[in-house]
């Protein structure tokens, strides 16, 4: 016995973030000695699926013809060779978008901001959520992740940026999600173009603090469920 078998590689095509109803293929790549591949989904009876290897036996395909809520989650795969089962792959997180209606994204006081000033991006959802994600197109670290610490659900989250520099300029979208499954996201908001004028440069800008608020009825129209308590939010760069 020459030690444990190397872990396989797990990935999804066309990617790991899939819109409701679209197809996705999960690939597990092991070694040429593989006889069988197994895919496990967290919190599902194992194995979630088994497949024979495709020639030349070093990988297997797991097909999802139409993405739904049931397929969203965290996966690992294994392969079996004549000497036994491999180590598990690194996890693959398959996220479904389109689980909820799109939030709306606004820039306050305006999407036209002077370098050195402050701007707040406000993401508002139709139904109360406890996680909000802000995406910037073509950014090295595109995801700003706000999650309620206490599970309190909010209709909106604020992403303050101060001081603003030219690096903050670009196209943003936001998503919302429920705590019971962070693998289920809303449709993306309509894009918001943040335009920064002026010449102050700062190569490492970042939002200062991130807060979720429950505005009163006059501040946020149509919160028919009533006001919800303020809660602290953790900020995560991913």
């Amino acid at each position: 016995q020459a030690g444990p078998l190397p872990k396989p590689t797990l990935w999804a095509e066309p990617g790991s973030v899939i819109s409701w109803g679209n197809s996705v293929t999960i690939w597990c790549q092991g070694t040429l000695e593989a006889r069988e591949y197994r895919l496990d989904k967290e919190e599902s009876p194992a194995p979630w699926d088994r497949q024979n290897p495709l020639e030349p036996k070093n990988k297997a395909r797991f097909s999802i013809p139409s993405m739904t809520e049931d397929y969203a989650g965290r996966y690992r795969c294994y392969y079996r060779s004549p000497v036994g089962w491999s180590q598990p792959s690194d996890p693959l997180e398959l996220v479904m978008t389109g689980a909820y209606s799109k939030p709306t994204l606004s820039a306050l006081p305006s999407p036209l901001v002077t370098s050195g000033k402050s701007v707040t991006l406000l993401c508002q959802s139709r139904s109360p959520m406890d996680t909000f994600l802000l995406i910037k197109e073509r950014a090295a670290h595109p995801l700003l992740h706000l999650r309620s610490e206490h599970g309190a659900q909010q209709h909106q989250a604020e992403f303050p940026m101060s001081p603003v520099t030219s690096v903050h300029g670009g196209t943003y979208r936001c998503f919302s999600s429920h705590g019971f499954s962070h693998y289920l996201l809303s449709h993306p908001s309509d894009p918001l173009e943040l335009i920064v004028s002026g010449s102050l440069e700062d190569p490492r800008p970042s939002p200062t603090r991130s807060v979720s608020t429950a505005a009163g009825p006059e501040d946020q129209p149509l919160m028919p469920t009533g006001s919800v308590p303020h809660s602290g939010l953790r900020r995560h760069w991913e």
């Epitope: 409701w20 109803g21 739904t68 809520e69 479904m96 389109g98 689980a99 909820y100 209606s101 799109k102 939030p103 709306t104 606004s106 306050l108 006081p109 305006s110 406000l122 508002q124 139709r126 139904s127 909106q156 289920l184 809303s186 505005a215 009825p217 006059e218 501040d219 946020q220 129209p221 149509l222 028919p224 469920t225």
Partner: antibody, heavy 117, light 113 residues
Framework: QVQLVQSGAEVKKPGASVKVSCKAS????????IDWVKQPPGKGLEWIGY????????SYNQKFKGRVTMTVDKSTSTVYMELSSLRSEDTAVYYC??????????WGQGTTVTVSS | DIVMTQSPDSLAVSLGERATINCKSS????????????LAWYQQKPGQAPRLLIY???TRESGVPDRFAGSGSGTDFTLTISSLQAEDVAVYYC?????????FGQGTKLEIK
């Protein structure tokens, strides 16, 4: 594509009840509010209320409260609107519509309800 | 309840000409929280369900021709069809979604002159 398919036309007598269905497909059913809108013949649109399939939460226009009940069957992705104590002024086309952010981005084809003795 | 009033009730415009429909709300639809106007426009052709054209007063729904444009803020809003086509014959409704109950304008019937 998003589709909301409603049940067929109904003719009812005054005092009776009617139950209209709206079957959704082409999207994640549980996460979108479904509203009902009334349109009397040759007239405008009037909001009746909504139901949130995920939780069953409802909210009704005060004008219809006590006479309207909205329910959901998640297993068939169908919502229902029942209107009781029908009167002649309830004669209308009833639409179900999917809410985006309180506005409606998809509509059913409509169900004609005629109340006549 | 917020009352929505459209004008005119009916309108006849020549093909290729501009059509303008107005909508007035009994209170402001501009939110202080996000600086957005909670107003949508719908088109309803004879025998059909309404179709969303515009939301947030000026954002065109996907697939809607760019000859349709929404404008206005606060209590006064306008739907403009820049060059009327035969298929635009319909009744047009504005809707406020600032507060419950959701309310619609009475509709404007658009015909070809």
């Amino acid at each position: 594509q998003v589709q909301l398919v409603q049940s067929g036309a109904e003719v009812k007598k005054p005092g009776a009840s009617v139950k209209v269905s709206c079957k959704a497909s082409g999207y994640s059913f549980s996460g979108f509010y479904i509203d009902w809108v009334k349109q009397p013949p040759g007239k405008g649109l009037e909001w009746i209320g909504y139901i949130f399939p995920s939780s069953g939460e409802t909210s009704y226009n005060q004008k219809f409260k006590g006479r309207v009940t909205m329910t959901v069957d998640k297993s068939t992705s169908t919502v229902y609107m029942e209107l009781s104590s029908l009167r002649s002024e309830d004669t209308a086309v009833y639409y179900c519509a999917r809410q985006a952010f309180y506005y409606f981005d998809s509509w059913g084809q409509g169900t004609t309800v005629t109340v006549s003795s | 309840d917020i009352v929505m009033t459209q004008s005119p009730d009916s309108l006849a415009v020549s093909l290729g000409e501009r059509a303008t429909i107005n909508c007035k709300s009994s209170q402001s639809l501009l939110s202080s929280s996000n600086q957005k106007n909670y107003l949508a426009w719908y088109q309803q052709k004879p025998g059909q369900a309404p179709r969303l054209l515009i939301y947030w007063a000026s954002t065109r729904e996907s697939g809607v021709p760019d000859r349709f444009a929404g404008s206005g803020s606060g209590t006064d809003f306008t739907l403009t069809i820049s060059s009327l086509q035969a298929e635009d014959v319909a009744v047009y409704y504005c809707q406020q979604y600032y507060s419950y109950p959701l309310t619609f304008g009475q509709g404007t019937k658009l015909e070809i002159k």
